[in-house]
């Protein structure tokens, strides 16, 4: 008799996932000399601790402090780009400004990107057919206490200015639900950090409004005056211009060298 | 260096046609988005179009002053920038610019410009 | 479009520190720069994205841009730095403010 197995709303672990990930820190490791010390079967023995033969919904982040400890990276504390529903343009950016730093690009969210994971209470296995989704099922489960454990270590870990590359073109501009906002915003320290600058994407060339006057970036403004940090905006009113320079750095009119 | 040296100034009565043109060196031409700038006598700097480079299919922009009457040009073979001015007005008198338009990810500047050609709309 | 506005005049003695302002709503929500231009010559770029300086610019130029003003800079004034400065920012187009005159006394 097959035993019964518990379905949730959510996609199932990414497929390949344990080959995923160890092929990734192997990656990431012979990339980044920093790194060559980690021993990547550590990490995925870690990783797969955090929440291997535990309740999807009942994970915490202590669950991922061996792996937290292993993934222990230094990135210089103020070229820390943050971003909040506009990741591929903000992993384009850093891949061509390469002193800036998303959290994708340090080694645990680079092991993380994109990929979803979650196993069964008392049972070795990882369930490849479906996981809770954070909305609909719960939101202790394995992916969103991840990321909210490693974002919560990013922004502790920002000074002086930080960036925050922010999606003009959707409704919430700064979503309070976010990743973003959740989390990141409320982990600035501010005894670090000095400014917070947003970057508000513009759609498209036509548009010449102040975005940073939009009702949710006011919102932003508060939350993070209130903490005692100051809080900068700056419309990017040419989304071609920041793709084709992202795209193309070596495109003589993107150089800001005079 | 980068060089850019304007002509085809000169005088012309109202409603009349001039062609400017600036002749580019110094630099690959075709890699950047160039500009014209315009400056009444005693008077400020005012933009007047610019003009995009290949890869943005030479896209198009006028300051409503001179929008449907002004065409901005450029031919990447000949390393030079044309405006072509229609229907002038007393009010376009001014040195034309030629302005390489310079930036970062971020943001746009003009980071060289020609010494100007004097346009006089008179009669 | 965003409007700039930039005093007419502006005086400062040798050695003095000068600062022209730039006064637009909200300019600190965009990416300003400064131009320099002596009379019968082009204008010249001293500061771009705010407070960047251009390779061959005096280090005593400096920009700074918050909230509703942009402010030019220039330390230990020179007679050479007599000119007419422009504010110039973007919003979808091109924006020159009114320009400054300052005079070295």
């Known amino acids: 008799v097959p035993r019964w197995r518990q379905q949730w709303s959510g996609p199932g672990t990414t497929k390949r996932f344990p080959e995923t990930v160890l092929a990734r820190c192997v990656k990431y490791t012979e990339i980044h000399p920093e790194m060559r010390h980690v021993d990547c079967q550590s990490v995925w023995d870690a990783f797969k601790g955090a929440f291997i033969s535990k309740h999807p919904c009942n994970i915490t982040e202590e669950d991922y402090q061996p792996l937290m400890k292993l993934g222990t990276q230094t990135v210089p504390c103020n070229k820390i780009l943050l971003w909040s529903r506009i990741k591929d343009l903000a992993h384009q950016f850093t891949q061509v400004q390469r002193d800036m730093f998303t959290l994708e690009d340090t080694l645990l969210g680079y092991l993380a990107d994109d990929l979803t994971w979650c196993g069964e209470f008392n049972t070795s296995k990882i369930n490849y057919q479906s996981c809770p989704d954070w909305r609909k099922d719960c939101s202790n489960n394995p992916v969103s206490v991840f990321w909210k454990t490693v974002s919560r270590r990013f922004a502790e870990a920002a000074c002086d200015v930080v960036h925050v590359m922010l999606n003009g073109s959707r409704s919430k501009i700064f979503d309070k639900n976010s990743t973003f906002g959740s989390v990141e915003v409320h982990n600035l320290q501010p005894e670090k950090v000095q400014t917070l600058e947003a970057w508000v994407i513009h759609g498209g060339r036509e548009d010449s409004r102040d975005l940073c006057q939009d009702p949710t970036i006011k919102e932003l403004e508060s939350i993070i005056s209130k903490r005692n940090i100051q809080f900068s905006c700056k419309n990017i009113y040419r989304p071609d211009k920041f793709l084709q320079c992202v795209k193309n750095p070596e495109d003589s009119s993107c150089t800001s060298e005079i | 260096q980068v060089q850019l040296v304007e002509s085809g100034g000169g005088l012309v009565q109202p409603g009349g046609s001039l062609r400017l043109s600036c002749a580019a060196s110094?630099?690959?031409?075709?890699?950047?988005?160039m500009n014209w700038v315009r400056q009444a006598p005693g008077k400020g700097l005012e933009w007047v179009s610019h003009i995009r480079k290949k890869n943005t299919s030479y896209t198009t922009e006028y300051a409503a002053s001179v929008k449907g009457r002004f065409t901005i040009s450029r031919d990447n073979s000949k390393n030079t920038l044309y405006l072509q001015m229609n229907s002038l007005r007393a009010e376009d008198t001014a040195v034309y610019y030629c302005?390489?338009?310079?930036?970062?990810?971020?943001?746009?500047?003009?980071?060289?410009w020609g010494q100007g050609t004097l346009v006089t709309v008179s009669s | 479009d965003i409007e700039l506005t930039q005093p007419p005049s502006v005086s400062v003695a040798p050695g003095q520190t000068a600062r022209i302002s730039c006064s637009g709503d909200n300019i600190g929500h965009y990416y300003v720069s400064w131009y320099q231009q002596k009379p019968g010559q082009a204008p010249v770029l001293v500061i771009y994205?705010?407070?960047n300086r251009p390779s061959g610019i005096p280090e005593r130029f400096s920009g700074s841009n918050s909230g509703n003003t942009a402010t030019l800079t220039i330390s230990g004034t020179q007679a050479e730095d007599e000119a007419d400065y422009y504010c110039q920012s973007y919003n979808g187009t091109y924006v020159f403010g009114g320009g400054t005159k300052l005079t070295v006394l």
């Open positions: 302005a390489r338009e310079d930036g970062s990810y971020m943001t746009d500047y003009f980071a060289y």
């Open positions: 110094g630099f690959t031409f075709s890699s950047y988005a």
């Open positions: 994205s705010d407070s």
